[in-house]
């Protein structure tokens, strides 16, 4: 913490300007009025403060706004944003996309994924939902940031906005996030024709249930291996060899390359070896001929 001193009369600060770069930390603390700093935040980013000096300015703002900064200050933080922790950002209420854009630009090239994720979260809370303008801003200024949101936040995306999401925006999404986004995508794209539908839904298929994957296998979509590998393990396991063959079309040969990786490995273990042999790929590990398969997932037989 910066120690308290009184400000020498000749160092009194009446406006935020470049002369402040010559102030020592102690002098900044003593001489800069927090309210003045807040009122003239738009000037701060143009002044080449050291990181140590920025620490002092942040400290001043923290004292003035212990419950969190107002958006008028947040909008003009500039490089001072780099000093913010997720805990600081959690106190904010942000509704302006201009504020979001400004801070996303500042964070570029810095290791600030936690801060950015928290900032986006605050924007979604502040705006009430993840609307089209917010999604457009994220995809333009922070590709991949959509996936930094929790499933709970993503649940506020209206299906009508899903069309604005690009495949690359979903690259870092995990299964729980895709579980939320996939049904919205299925609703949003349901009026499209088969081939157009598949192109649109493909990036979201990591959240699809078995029945949807089975239905796709009837539509000659020729799913690529990369998409197949992103399908939920639980969605792939019930598929028959014939269904997987129809689903992948000419890409079925890729199963050999992925033989040791989930979900292909787990799927192979559930198939009859005779059925796997019909693919002519040399896949090994299936259930030997003559063995009885008990499906214990159908619990009524046991209860």
């Amino acid at each position: 913490d910066v120690e308290r001193t009184t400000c020498p009369p000749e160092k009194e600060v009446h406006e935020i300007d470049e002369s402040l770069i010559f102030y020592k930390k102690r002098e900044l603390e003593a001489c800069v009025d927090a309210a003045l700093l807040a009122a003239q935040m738009d000037r701060v980013d143009a002044i080449p403060f050291t990181y140590e000096q920025l620490d002092v300015l942040k400290h001043k703002l923290d004292e003035l706004y212990p419950q969190g900064y107002p958006e008028s200050v947040i909008r003009h933080l500039g490089h001072l944003f780099l000093k913010m922790s997720p805990e600081d950002i959690r106190k904010w209420n942000v509704t302006s996309l201009e504020t979001l854009k400004a801070l996303l630009k500042v964070s570029k090239g810095h290791e600030m994924s936690a801060q950015v994720a928290t900032l986006i979260d605050r924007v979604v809370v502040g705006r009430g939902q993840l609307d089209k303008d917010t999604v457009d801003t994220l995809t333009a200024f922070c590709p991949g940031c959509l996936c930094s949101l929790s499933p709970e936040r993503l649940s506020s995306v209206p299906p009508s906005v899903i069309g604005a999401v690009r495949p690359q925006d979903l690259d870092t999404c995990g299964p729980r996030q895709l579980d939320v986004l996939y049904p919205k995508a299925r609703l949003a794209f349901q009026n499209m024709s088969g081939s157009e539908y598949f192109v649109k839904i493909r990036p979201f298929l990591g959240g699809a249930p078995t029945e949807d994957v089975k239905a796709l296998s009837q539509q000659n979509v020729s799913m690529d291996l990369a998409t197949f590998m992103k399908l939920r393990r639980e969605a792939v396991l019930p598929l028959t060899v014939a269904e997987v063959q129809k689903l992948l079309g000419p890409h079925v040969e890729g199963l050999k390359v992925e033989e040791q990786h989930s979900p292909v490995r787990d799927w192979i273990l559930k198939q009859r070896q005779d059925d796997l042999d019909t693919l002519g790929l040399g896949l090994q590990g299936g259930i030997p001929n003559g063995y009885l398969i008990l499906d214990l997932s159908v619990r009524e037989a046991l209860s």
Partner: antibody, heavy 122, light 107 residues
Framework: QVQLQESGPGLVKPSETLSLTCTVS????????WSWVRQPPGKGLEWIGY???????NSNPSLKSRVIISVDTSKNQFSLKLSSVTAADTAVYYC????????????????WGRGTLVTVSS | EIVMTQSPATLSVSPGERATLSCRAS??????LAWYQQKPGQAPRLLIY???TRATGIPARFSGSGSGTEFTLTISSLQSEDFAVYYC?????????FGQGTRLEIK
Amino acid sequence: QVQLQESGPGLVKPSETLSLTCTVSGGSINNYYWSWVRQPPGKGLEWIGYIFYSGSTNSNPSLKSRVIISVDTSKNQFSLKLSSVTAADTAVYYCAREVGRIAVAGWFFDLWGRGTLVTVSS
Amino acid sequence: EIVMTQSPATLSVSPGERATLSCRASQSVNANLAWYQQKPGQAPRLLIYGASTRATGIPARFSGSGSGTEFTLTISSLQSEDFAVYYCQQYNNWPLTFGQGTRLEIK
């Protein structure tokens, strides 16, 4: 074939929480989306919300603040909790399976439980 | 939310005759509409989806038509087991919404 069975108390006091469970038998809960739909006596149907086996949910905005839908894949069950109930929540509550086929890409219901009447009264 | 309005509230038709039930949406739902039949004390049963596609096991006398905001369910030759309440449901957007129902009774 797959069957659905609702269970839970038939009488709930006002301001308390209504709790129902739907048991899926004859198939895995993993393959579809599962919904709750209710029907007040002599009235039409109202969709409450759905759940996916992973726990992902979506519910009717008119009920969202009071609704919790959860799933227990180990028991092949999903549940509904509706808090702060009033007499207006008296209804037959159905659990239903959403068709979930991309070929028809729809959010409609091809399989229903028999329904269970829940009365809200002191 | 999309409001579904069914008409008439009650329709009286003689067995063997044709019944025509209507459903109107407050905004376009494209062809994302389903029809259900419900008999007293029973759960609804899916009849039609995609506005015009019959569900598995549904007799050919049931047919659906329409797109956008106006939809029709037609039962070409009424059988005794067809007298019930019929509901339409849109799935073009959440929340999923149902019509208030049309009661089809014997004349």
